[in-house]
Interface confidence: low
């Protein structure tokens, strides 16, 4: 009889995704003898850390240890004790910490220092905590989904992927939406790029990939909302902001100091004659859409084609996986089905946003009001970003696949990050015995 879990045959890895709004811990496992194969690593656990993102702990760093305890203890339970010492732990911080670093490198370093000291106390092989770049975030997300979809393998996969199964080896583009940034990454048709800053070349499993990527800092859904509020309060009827992006009857008081806390609102900052203002929802998708569009500067483009804010974007090519908040929001709104056209999505958003807040609260009684109140904005923002920001059309909409998990693993940058740091994506096609190769990400 085969032993149920021979520790020496199974390996584990832990990645903490320190996002702007929260931290999640992912545990991955794979058969040791197959670690250079594509598609063999899979997620066994996701633990969501209770509380906000680590950047919010800047004034209370002494609480970071307690903050991380529950999920690190969960990792101790899930991973066999005999494997603890050889299980690597990586923490990657994204746009929330990029923003904090923009405000103060010292404060960002202080947070990371306490995070590192806390994580070093566990019996795992801690490999460090760092703020990853937007380019890395885009690249690793692209690697994750294509790895899980089996796009790097010439061999027949041992699993089938539904509904994203395609017989060709064309890679999927990656669309990632976080709280503070959003990334677009794909292989364009034209190999030459007008903007070297947005170009990545890597060789994976014996094939060269020329990838376009860009991360838009401040254009995650939460920071986009702060931007919109800061823009609109400039011209609002004083401390009442009649906001089309919130349901009719919704009211919320916002502190001006909170509004201007983030570097993302600096361009709209002005001296206001009040310390607080009240958002009052009027629930109008069309007006909300118009308001969101004002966040995208499309009047300036030094290239043949741009996304927005003068950032180069080559013509879109192929299928795209849209994950993280793209998926969470559209899934909540029940709009992830491949059968739902862009026109239908817009129609559904119009209906949703115009529903009275009291009605919405009753219909979604189990959902926290803070999140519930923002789905109208987030859904509208996603449509605006994809259509006007990235230039998807009603026709190319069908090439966007809203993906939460692929074969049980979350779509996101963490798996790609671990695969790269553990050298599990070889540059060349592995022979029957695994070879140790580094990658060029």
């Amino acid at each position: 009889t085969q032993n149920k879990a021979l520790p020496e045959n199974i390996k584990y890895g832990i990645v903490l995704d320190a996002g702007s709004s929260h931290t999640s811990l992912y545990i991955y496992k794979w058969p040791a003898e197959k670690e250079n194969d594509t598609g063999v690593v899979h997620q066994v656990e996701e633990c969501r850390v209770k509380g906000p993102g680590i950047s919010k702990y800047v004034q209370k760093v002494n609480e970071i240890g307690i903050y991380l305890t529950d999920c690190m203890e969960r990792a101790r339970e899930v991973i066999p004790r005999s494997q603890h010492q050889e299980t690597p732990v990586y923490l990657g911080a994204t746009a929330g910490m990029r923003l904090l670093r923009m405000e103060s490198e010292e404060l960002a370093d202080r947070v990371l220092d306490v995070v590192e000291r806390s994580l070093s106390n566990y019996p795992f092989d801690f490999q460090g905590a760092r703020i990853i770049t937007g380019q890395e975030e885009g690249a690793y997300g692209w690697i994750t989904i294509n790895y899980l979809l089996g796009k790097f393998s010439q061999k027949t996969r041992w699993f089938s992927i539904v509904p994203y199964e395609t017989n060709n080896q064309e890679t999927f583009g990656a669309l990632d939406l976080g709280g503070a940034s959003t990334q677009i990454t794909f292989v364009p048709q034209n190999q030459t790029t007008e903007s070297p800053d947005n170009a990545l070349q890597f060789r994976l499993y014996g094939k060269d990939y020329n990838v376009y990527t860009h991360s838009f800092l401040c254009y995650g859904k939460d920071q986009a909302l702060w931007q919109k509020l800061a823009k609109d309060i400039q011209v609002a009827s004083n401390e009442i902001l009649r906001d089309p992006c919130f349901h009719p009857g919704y009211k919320k008081v916002v502190n001006v100091s909170d509004l201007y806390k983030t570097p993302c609102t600096k361009r709209f900052e002005m001296t206001l004659p009040f310390q607080q203002f009240e958002i009052q929802g009027i629930g109008n998708y069309q007006q909300c859409h118009q308001s969101v569009l004002e966040l995208f500067n499309t009047s300036y483009c030094p290239y043949s084609q741009c996304a927005f804010n003068g950032i180069f974007l080559p013509p879109l090519q192929g299928d795209f996986g849209a994950f993280s908040a793209f998926y969470f929001v559209m899934n909540f709104l029940n709009l992830t089905s491949e059968k739902v056209s862009q026109e239908k999505v817009t129609e559904m958003m119009k209906k949703f946003c115009s529903q009275p807040w009291e009605e919405i609260k009753t219909s979604y009684a189990g959902v926290k009001e803070k999140y519930l109140s923002e789905y109208c904005f987030s859904g509208t923002y996603i449509l605006s970003l994809l259509l006007q920001g990235y230039h998807f059309t009603a026709d190319s909409w069908e090439h966007i696949h809203f993906i939460g998990k692929i074969q049980g693993s979350d779509a996101g940058w963490t798996l790609g990050y671990m695969l790269n740091l553990t050298n599990m994506i070889p540059a060349e096609q592995p022979l029957s015995t695994p070879l140790s190769h580094s990658t060029y990400v």
């Epitope: 011209v235 609002a236 009442i240 009649r242 607080q276 009027i282 109008n284 007006q287 909300c288």
Partner: antibody, heavy 119, light 109 residues
């Protein structure tokens, strides 16, 4: 039905202060922004300022900023407008008016108070 | 402050159309909503709201009154002037606090 009843006419000397009240019945003042508007004899309407009684936040027109104070007493459902350092050009009718949050329809006005400033 | 300019006083025959114009120094639109109101004021009375949000008729106002316009240019129209319409008419913006136009006196010719 909502009604705005203002205090009686006043005669003041230059340099004095006048305080006018506006009592609202039929609805809570917290449902509205409460505005004050000046109208000098034979002249047009001039907005002076307003209060959001719910949050006790005020906003004043530049012209009146240093001399006007608008307050609200939610317990009596009354709004007050105080104008200091009176001069002859302050002789006018003063109206209180509601603006329904979120400000689509200015529903109700008081009957007006005549303030005469004369030495 | 948003400065507002109204057309001069006018005299119109009974039953004729009266048109009053109002121009604002900057837009009073805000994402599809136009914060422009029109008032009627008769001697010794407080102003009475006729039109709100540029074109919405206030309750109890006869439908001979109508409002139009967006952005910075607005019009109040009385389709068939009646004797009781003799008054001063004010435009008012409520997009950014309040500002009133100077008023337009309508008389019978």
């Amino acid at each position: 039905e909502v009604q705005l009843v203002q205090s009686g006419a006043e005669v003041k000397k230059p340099g004095a202060t006048v305080k006018i009240s506006c009592k609202v019945s039929g609805d809570s003042i917290t449902a509205y922004f409460m505005h004050w508007v000046q109208q000098a004899p034979g002249k047009g309407l001039e907005w002076m300022g307003r209060i959001d009684p719910d949050h006790e936040r005020t906003k004043y027109a530049e012209k009146f900023k240093n001399r006007v104070t608008i307050t609200a007493d939610t317990s009596t459902n009354t709004v007050y407008m105080e104008l200091s350092s009176l001069r002859s050009e302050d002789t006018a009718v003063y109206y209180c008016a509601t603006e329904r949050v979120p400000g689509f329809e200015t529903d109700y006005w008081g009957q007006g108070v005549m303030v005469t400033v004369s030495s | 402050d948003i400065v507002m300019t109204q057309s001069p006083d006018l005299a119109v025959s009974l039953g004729e159309r009266a048109t009053i114009n109002c121009r604002t120094q900057q837009t009073v639109d805000h994402y599809g909503t136009t914060y422009m109101n029109w008032y009627q004021q008769k001697p010794g009375q407080p102003p009475k709201l006729l039109i709100y949000l540029a074109s919405s008729l206030a309750s109890g106002v006869p439908d001979r009154f109508s409002g139009s316009g967006s952005g910075t240019d607005f019009t109040l129209t009385i389709s068939s002037l009646q004797a009781e319409d003799v008054a001063v008419y004010y435009c008012q913006q409520s997009r950014n606090l309040w500002t009133f136009g100077g008023g337009t006196k309508v008389e019978i010719k």
